[in-house]
Interface confidence: low
C-alpha cells in the first residue's frame, strides 16, 4: 500500500456497563471495537468501508485503558493500510461492541450488542504528528488519536510518490521527504547516475566513471587533464595541442634540446656586465668600466674610466682616485678653467665670450663640436639609438650601431638567429644578414670569419711616451694613450707644469 491510517485507542469509559439499547451487560460489557474508514461524507451513511475496516479482540470490560501493543492479537495502534492517493479528507466510524463469546474473535460470535459509536469527518494531512480527540455521549467516553503516514518507499503530501533508495548502476540516491531524489555525494543527473568528476576536470579532455576521478583522453595529462602531452622526446618545449613541441625561450632544435640562451640560463657575467650569446663558450661578457676578466670578475684601476678631464692625469688611491690638472684647470675632475679669452682657450674654431667682467669665459662651438672648450667632437651616441644592447660608434659626421649577435638593422632592431653556431673566430661579432652571417672582427683580425691575423698594430710602434699604456682603438690605425701620473697630452709627452703652448686634447 501507499499509506496507513493509524488509530490509537487510549481509554474507554463505560462506568455503568450499559449497552446502547439501555440494557446492562452481565456480568459486564466485554468490549471490542469495529472501525470503518471511508471517503469523506458530509453526512455519514451506511455502506462499504471504502478506505478499509478492522476489528479488535476484546480489549477490556466496561472501563479500561488500552495499552500500545506492536504485534499479535490486539495490536494498538490499529493499522488501516490503503493503496491509493490519500485525498486529505476522510470519514471514520468507531463502534464499541459487547460480546458474550470468544475473546480473540468476537466478530464471529452470535449475540453481539452495540455499546456506542462515534463518527468523525474531517481533513487530515499526511504527517507523523498524532491528532488527539475525545468523544462523549451520555453513557460512554472514548479517548483516541489518529494520523496518516506513508508506507515505506512512499512520499509526498498524499503518499503518491514512490521512491526506493538505491546505489547501483542505475542510480545513486536517497529519497527526500517529498519523494524527490537526493543524489548521494559525487553523483548528479535526473536519476543520479552521472558521476561528478574531480573538481576542475577538463570538460572535453577528461571524463570519469566514478566520482572524484579525472581520466584523461589520449594526448592529455595532468590531474585535471588540462595539460597536453608534447611530442615524445621534447626536452625544453611545451604544447598547446597534443603531440606538439614548441620550444621554450632560448632553446632550439627539433626537440628543444639546444641551449641558445646560455646567458639567461646560467648568468655567467658578473658585476653588471652585458652577456652576449656568442663566442666559443656560447657567451661573451662585455665589462663595465672598472672591471675585466672573462666574466668581468676582476676589478680594474679606479682610473680606468679616465675620469680626469682637460688632459688631467689620474692617480689611483685606496678607494678612489686623484686628478692632477694641467695649468689653467682645477676641480675634482679638472673640469673648471682658470683661463680667460686672452688665453685663446676655445679649440676647433670656437668663439670665446667673456663672463663675469672678464674673470671667466664661455666658448660658442661650431657645428659637430662640444665641450667647455669645444674640444670634443659631438657624440651622436648620447641618445642611445642602438636597440637590443647594440654598441654605438661615432664615425666622422655620422654614427653606426654595432649589434649584439642575433640582431641586425640600422639600430639593431631586427632579431635574427643564424648566428647561433658562433661562426666568427677570435671573438668576432656575428651579424645575420639576408645572405648569411657576417663577422665584425676585433682589432688585429680580419677575413669573412675573422680567421686572418693582421700584422700591423697601431701600438706596435710605441707611440705613447713616458711609460704610458697604449690601447688599440676602434680601427687598427687608431690608438689611445693612458698617461702615468705627472704627464699629459695625446701621447703623454708633456710633463705637468709646462706652460701650454699647444691645444689640449681631452
Amino acid at each position: 500500500g501507499s499509506g496507513i491510517f493509524q488509530l490509537r485507542l487510549q481509554e474507554f469509559v463505560n462506568q455503568r456497563g450499559m449497552l446502547a439499547n439501555g440494557q446492562s451487560c452481565e456480568p459486564g460489557c466485554r468490549t471490542f471495537f469495529r472501525i470503518c474508514l471511508k471517503h469523506f461524507q458530509a453526512t455519514f451513511s451506511e455502506g462499504p468501508c471504502t478506505f478499509g475496516n478492522v476489528s479488535t479482540p476484546v480489549l477490556g470490560t466496561n472501563s479500561f485503558v488500552v495499552r500500545d501493543k506492536n504485534s499479535g492479537s490486539g495490536r494498538n495502534p490499529l493499522q488501516l493500510p490503503f493503496n491509493f492517493t490519500w485525498p486529505g479528507t476522510f470519514s471514520l466510524n468507531i463502534q464499541a461492541w459487547h460480546t458474550p463469546g470468544d475473546d480473540l474473535r468476537p466478530e464471529t460470535s452470535p449475540g453481539n450488542s452495540l455499546i456506542s459509536q462515534i463518527i468523525i469527518q474531517g481533513s487530515l494531512a499526511v504527517g507523523k504528528i498524532w491528532r488527539t480527540d475525545e468523544q462523549n455521549d451520555t453513557l460512554t467516553r472514548l479517548s483516541y488519536s489518529y494520523r496518516v503516514i506513508c508506507s515505506d518507499n512512499y512520499y509526498g503530501e498524499s503518499c503518491s510518490r514512490l521512491c526506493k533508495k538505491r546505489d547501483d548502476h542505475f542510480g545513486h540516491y536517497e529519497c527526500q521527504p517529498d519523494g524527490s531524489l537526493s543524489c548521494l555525494p559525487g553523483w548528479t543527473g535526473k536519476y543520479c547516475d552521472q558521476p561528478i568528476c574531480l573538481s576542475g576536470c577538463h570538460e572535453q579532455n577528461g571524463y570519469c566513471s566514478k566520482p572524484d576521478e579525472c581520466i584523461c583522453r589520449p594526448g592529455w595529462q595532468g590531474r585535471l587533464c588540462n595539460e597536453c602531452i608534447p611530442h615524445n622526446g621534447c626536452r625544453h618545449g611545451t604544447c598547446s595541442i597534443p603531440w606538439q613541441c614548441a620550444c621554450d625561450e632560448g632553446w632550439g632544435g627539433l626537440f628543444c634540446d639546444q641551449d641558445l640562451n646560455y646567458c639567461t640560463h646560467h648568468s655567467p657575467c658578473k658585476n653588471g656586465s652585458t652577456c652576449s650569446n656568442s663566442g666559443p663558450k656560447g657567451y661573451t661578457c662585455t665589462c663595465l668600466p672598472g672591471y675585466t676578466g672573462e666574466h668581468c670578475e676582476l676589478g680594474l684601476s679606479k682610473c680606468a674610466s679616465n675620469p680626469c678631464r682637460n688632459g688631467g692625469s689620474c692617480k689611483d688611491q685606496e678607494n678612489s682616485y686623484h686628478c692632477l690638472c694641467p695649468p689653467g684647470y682645477y676641480g675634482q675632475h679638472c673640469e673648471h678653467s682658470t683661463l680667460t679669452c686672452a688665453d685663446s682657450p676655445c679649440f676647433n674654431g670656437g668663439s670665446c665670450r667673456e663672463r663675469n667682467q672678464g674673470s671667466s669665459y664661455a666658448c660658442e662651438c661650431p657645428p659637430n663640436f662640444t665641450g667647455s672648450n669645444c674640444e670634443k667632437k659631438v657624440d651622436r651616441c648620447t641618445s642611445n639609438p642602438c636597440a637590443n644592447g647594440g654598441q654605438c660608434q661615432n664615425r666622422g659626421p655620422s654614427r653606426t650601431c654595432r649589434c649584439r649577435p642575433g640582431f641586425t638593422g640600422t639600430h639593431c632592431e631586427l632579431h635574427i638567429s643564424d648566428c647561433a653556431r658562433s661562426p666568427c673566430a677570435h671573438g668576432g661579432t656575428c651579424h645575420d644578414l639576408e645572405n648569411g652571417p657576417v663577422c665584425t672582427c676585433p682589432a688585429g683580425f680580419s677575413g669573412r670569419r675573422c680567421e686572418v691575423r693582421i700584422t700591423h698594430d697601431a701600438c706596435a710602434s710605441g707611440p705613447c711616451f713616458n711609460g704610458a699604456t697604449c690601447y688599440t682603438g676602434l680601427s687598427p690605425n687608431n690608438f689611445v694613450c693612458n698617461c702615468p701620473y705627472g704627464f699629459v697630452g695625446s701621447r703623454c709627452e708633456f710633463p705637468v707644469g709646462l706652460p701650454p703652448s699647444f691645444p689640449w686634447v681631452a
Partner: nanobody, 120 residues
Framework: EVQLVESGGGLVQPGGSLRLSCTAS????????IGWFRQAPGKEPEGISC????????YDADSVKGRFTISRDNAKNTVYLQMNSLKPEDTAVYYC?????????????WGQGTQVTVSS
C-alpha cells in the same frame, strides 16, 4: 454543536480586495485556534493562514504572504481574512476551520465554505 459559518465571498476583479468572515458557535471561541484554507476545482486543499487562541499567526501559503491578513475578534466570535491584490489563481472555495485546540495544528471542524472568484 460546533458551527463555522463563512461569508464575504463573491466575484472580484484582479487587483481587488475582499474581506471574509467566519462566525463560530458551539464552543468556547477564545480557547480555539481558527484558520482558513481553500480548494480550487481539481486541486488539493491549500492552507492559507491560522491564528491561535493566543493570537499568534501562521501563514501556510507563501503565495498569500503580504496580501492576505488574518485577525480575530473574540467578542464577536469571528475570524476575518482580509484579501488584497487578488489574482485569478486565488479563485477557490474558502473554508474556515479549527483544529479544536488552542494551537494551529490541523483541522477538526470546518464550515461549508464561501466561493471567491477573481476574474475580469
Amino acid at each position: 454543536e460546533v458551527q463555522l459559518v463563512e461569508s464575504g465571498g463573491g466575484l472580484v476583479q484582479p487587483g481587488g480586495s475582499l474581506r471574509l468572515s467566519c462566525t463560530a458557535s458551539g464552543f468556547t471561541f477564545d480557547d480555539y485556534a481558527i484558520g482558513w484554507f481553500r480548494q480550487a476545482p481539481g486541486k488539493e486543499p491549500e492552507g492559507i493562514s491560522c491564528i491561535s487562541s493566543s493570537g499568534s499567526i501562521t501563514y501556510d501559503a507563501d503565495s498569500v504572504k503580504g496580501r492576505f491578513t488574518i485577525s480575530r475578534d473574540n467578542a464577536k466570535n469571528t475570524v476575518y481574512l482580509q484579501m488584497n491584490s487578488l489574482k485569478p489563481e486565488d479563485t477557490a472555495v474558502y473554508y474556515c476551520a479549527t483544529p479544536g485546540i488552542a494551537a494551529c495544528r490541523g483541522i477538526h471542524y470546518w464550515g461549508q465554505g464561501t466561493q471567491v472568484t477573481v476574474s475580469s
